[in-house]
Interface confidence: low
Amino acid sequence: TPEVWVQVQMEATELSSFTVHCGFLGPGSISLVTVSWGGPDGAGGTKLAVLHPELGTRQWAPARQARWETQSSISLALEDSGASSPFANTTFCCKFASFPEGSWESCGSLPPSSDPGLSAPPTPVPILRAD
């Protein structure tokens, strides 16, 4: 069964910067990746970035840079707005559309006790079944 993993890191050198890493574990080719925060895409979440393997990437503030790391994983750098640190306890979700499997989505957040720059990869928690 395909799975999506999500890892959120606070940058050690820049405490207002966060990076979301997402990956797809499964067969098939990725046709689209959507990263949202505050909940799953289209159901309470706010879209931060869309990455298409051929058409390129689109991102919205506070996303700073979205990029492919491998053919099945992406990273998204975020710039926090300041003192309120909204990202610290926010849920980030990554949705991978894969052909022919369908869509798979998982969410993750910064571990509450994590030191800057350190974050153990969480166990994937699928939020939605295949669309």
Epitope: W37, D41, A43, T46, W60, S81, S84, S103, L128, D131
Partner: antibody, heavy 119, light 106 residues
Framework: EVKLVESGGGLVQPGGSLKLSCAVS????????MSWVRQTPEKRLELVAK????????NYPDTVKGRFTLSRDNVKNTLYLQMSSLKSEDTAIYYC????????????WGQGTSVTVSS | DIQMTQSPASLSASVGETVIITCRAS??????LAWYQQKQGKSPHLLVY???TLVEGVPSRFSGSGSATQFSLKINSLQPEDFGTYYC????????FGGGTKLEIK
């Protein structure tokens, strides 16, 4: 042409139930998040429910959580809003809206259906 | 929830005038803001999204601006069809709407 046509509104007593429907045409229904927005007699707008394109995930504000249930039939191209334990403050015009993932806003609205909760 | 405060609640203007409607968010919403127009007896329709992007087909006399917590909708050279009620809406998490601004003919 995109069309959203609501039905099912009417007069209901407090504590009663009502089911609204929204028949959709002119776009690939199964590709879009859909939502219901209501407009109170004071003309305030409030999002009451949102559902993902597959129907697998829904979202409600606290004002209606536990009382309203949003569902969709992607074969019939229809959106449903089951409302129960209705209160007088639920009196409003209810609009079915398409929630565009591209602009993250409601880019198409139906004509609305009126719900009056009164004894 | 993020609160959206619109001002003024109502205003009167003449055809040909320029008007500005403002919307303030209770916290930083970056550029996640939309504007809608509603005419009497009709449903709202989307004018502007992402704070400043005009929906295709919306006349260029409309313009949106702002970011973070302060936003505005400017209508240059008002036309008779521009009168109605305008709403802002944030889409930063769970969306909420402003209270509306009723634009009337003077």
């Amino acid at each position: 042409e995109v069309k959203l046509v609501e039905s099912g509104g009417g007069l209901v007593q407090p504590g009663g139930s009502l089911k609204l429907s929204c028949a959709v045409s002119g776009f690939t229904f199964s590709s879009y998040t859909m939502s219901w927005v209501r407009q109170t007699p004071e003309k305030r707008l409030e999002l009451v429910a949102k559902i993902s394109n597959s129907g697998g995930s829904t979202n409600y504000p606290d004002t209606v959580k536990g009382r309203f249930t949003l569902s969709r039939d992607n074969v019939k191209n229809t959106l449903y809003l089951q409302m129960s334990s209705l209160k007088s403050e639920d009196t409003a015009i209810y609009y079915c809206t398409r929630y565009s993932w591209d602009v993250y806003a409601m880019d198409y609205w139906g004509q609305g259906t009126s719900v009056t909760v009164s004894s | 929830d993020i609160q959206m405060t619109q001002s003024p609640a109502s205003l009167s203007a003449s055809v040909g005038e320029t008007v500005i409607i403002t919307c303030r968010a209770s916290e930083n919403i970056y550029s996640y803001l939309a504007w809608y127009q509603q005419k009497q007896g009709k449903s709202p329709h989307l004018l502007v999204y992402n704070a400043e992007t005009l929906v295709e087909g919306v006349p260029s006399r409309f313009s949106g601006s702002g970011s973070a917590t302060q936003f505005s909708l400017k209508i240059n050279s008002l036309q008779p069809e521009d009168f109605g009620t305008y709403y802002c809406q944030h889409h930063y998490g769970d969306p909420t709407f402003g209270g509306g601004t009723k634009l009337e003919i003077k």
